[in-house]
Interface confidence: low
């Protein structure tokens, strides 16, 4: 069964900068990735970025740069312009879609005990699965 993993990483040099890494484990060709925060996309979450393998990417503040790392994984750099970062206690969700087989979504967050520069371990939390 396909799975989605999510890692949230705080940058060691800039405590207001975070990077979300997401990947898809399974067969099939990824045709769309949606990253949201505050919950799953379409279920209370706010869209941060959309990545299309052929047509490029779109991102919305506070997302700074969304990019493909491999054919089945992406990264999203976030920058908080405020005095204190709201990202530490935030849930980030990644939805990977494979047309027309379906879509898979998992969420993750930065553990409270995480030191700057250390990434959180993979914490797949399946939200929605294709049947």
């Amino acid at each position: 069964t396909p799975e989605v993993w999510v890692q949230v990483q705080m940058e060691a040099t800039e405590l207001s900068s975070f990077t979300v890494h997401c990947g898809f484990l399974g067969p099939g060709s990824i045709s769309l990735v949606t990253v949201s925060w505050g919950g799953p996309d379409g279920a209370g979450g706010t869209k941060l970025a959309v990545l299309h393998p052929e047509l490029g990417t779109r991102q919305w503040a506070p997302a700074r740069q969304a990019r493909w790392e491999t054919q089945s994984s992406i990264s999203l750099a976030l920058e908080d312009s405020g005095a204190s970062s709201p990202f530490a206690n935030t849930t980030f969700c990644c939805k990977f879609a494979s047309f027309p087989e379906g879509s898979w979504e998992s969420c993750g967050s930065l553990p409270p005990s995480s030191d700057p520069g250390l990434s959180a371990p993979p914490t797949p939390v399946p939200i929605l699965r294709a049947d």
Epitope: F99, L128, A130
Partner: antibody, heavy 120, light 106 residues
Framework: EVQLVESGGGLVKPGGSLKLSCAAS????????MSWVRQTPAKRLEWVAT????????YYPDTVKGRFTISRDNAKNTLYLQMRSLRSEDTAMYYC?????????????WGQGTSVTVSS | QIVLTQSPAIMSASPGEKVTMTCSAS?????LYWYQQKPGSSPRLLIY???NLASGVPVRFSGSGSGTSYSLTLSRMEAEDAATYYC?????????FGAGTKLELK
């Protein structure tokens, strides 16, 4: 302005063949996934076929798989649907549909449709 | 395949009245879309990704829901909104549509 103009519909006998065309304009055709959707006389909407923009993958529901073939000619901005072994249940209005870049699973652009009647 | 059941099949509303119609999925759905079709015209995309308004769609339309239960709401009925509304999913192969809700002007 986005325009999708279907043609090629008509009356055909059961077991016959028909090829539908869809001329696209007003958008970058080669970058869009395209589909055919039909509407039965009972007004039910049914997905018929989809072709992706880049690597030309095609998808069909079991009801038409092996009988229908979707294809595209990006140089001519034209979408096609080759229909073979037609059955009475294939009688419908056939719509050409364009899918928006980042929500191309949504059917953003629709043509006016071309009518196909399968009857002896 | 996922079956989408729309209710009611037919409904009527007076101008200014609030209208809500539902789309129930036989299994959990990730993406849901709503279309409007007026007599003699092609369907038109209203809502994508459950709650996002398509370009040019009046703000009186809104979509919501998750899992297997979704709804389309019209905050104030207008004469031009008389049409048939269809929901559609692609979360599971094959793509399927609901049978539609016909909204008439009272």
């Amino acid at each position: 302005e986005v325009q999708l103009v279907e043609s090629g519909g008509g009356l055909v006998k059961p077991g016959g063949s028909l090829k539908l065309s869809c001329a696209a304009s007003g958008f970058t055709f080669s970058s869009y996934a395209m589909s055919w959707v039909r509407q039965t006389p009972a007004k039910r909407l049914e997905w018929v076929a989809t072709i992706t923009s880049g690597d030309i993958r095609t998808y069909y529901p079991d009801t038409v798989k092996g009988r229908f073939t979707i294809s595209r000619d990006n140089a001519k901005n034209t979408l096609y649907l080759q229909m073979r072994s037609l059955r009475s249940e294939d009688t419908a209005m056939y719509y050409c549909v364009g899918h928006d870049d980042f929500h191309f699973y949504a059917m953003d652009y629709w043509g006016q449709g071309t009518s196909v009647t399968v009857s002896s | 395949q996922i079956v989408l059941t729309q209710s009611p099949a037919i409904m009527s509303a007076s101008p200014g009245e609030k209208v809500t119609m539902t789309c129930s999925a036989s299994s959990s759905v990730s993406y849901l879309y709503w279309y409007q079709q007026k007599p003699g015209s092609s369907p038109r995309l209203l809502i994508y990704d459950t709650s996002n308004l398509a370009s040019g769609v009046p703000v009186r339309f809104s979509g919501s829901g998750s899992g297997t239960s979704y709804s389309l709401t019209l905050s104030r009925m207008e004469a031009e909104d008389a049409a048939t509304y269809y929901c559609q999913q692609w979360s599971s192969y094959p793509l399927t549509f609901g049978a539609g809700t016909k909204l008439e002007l009272k």
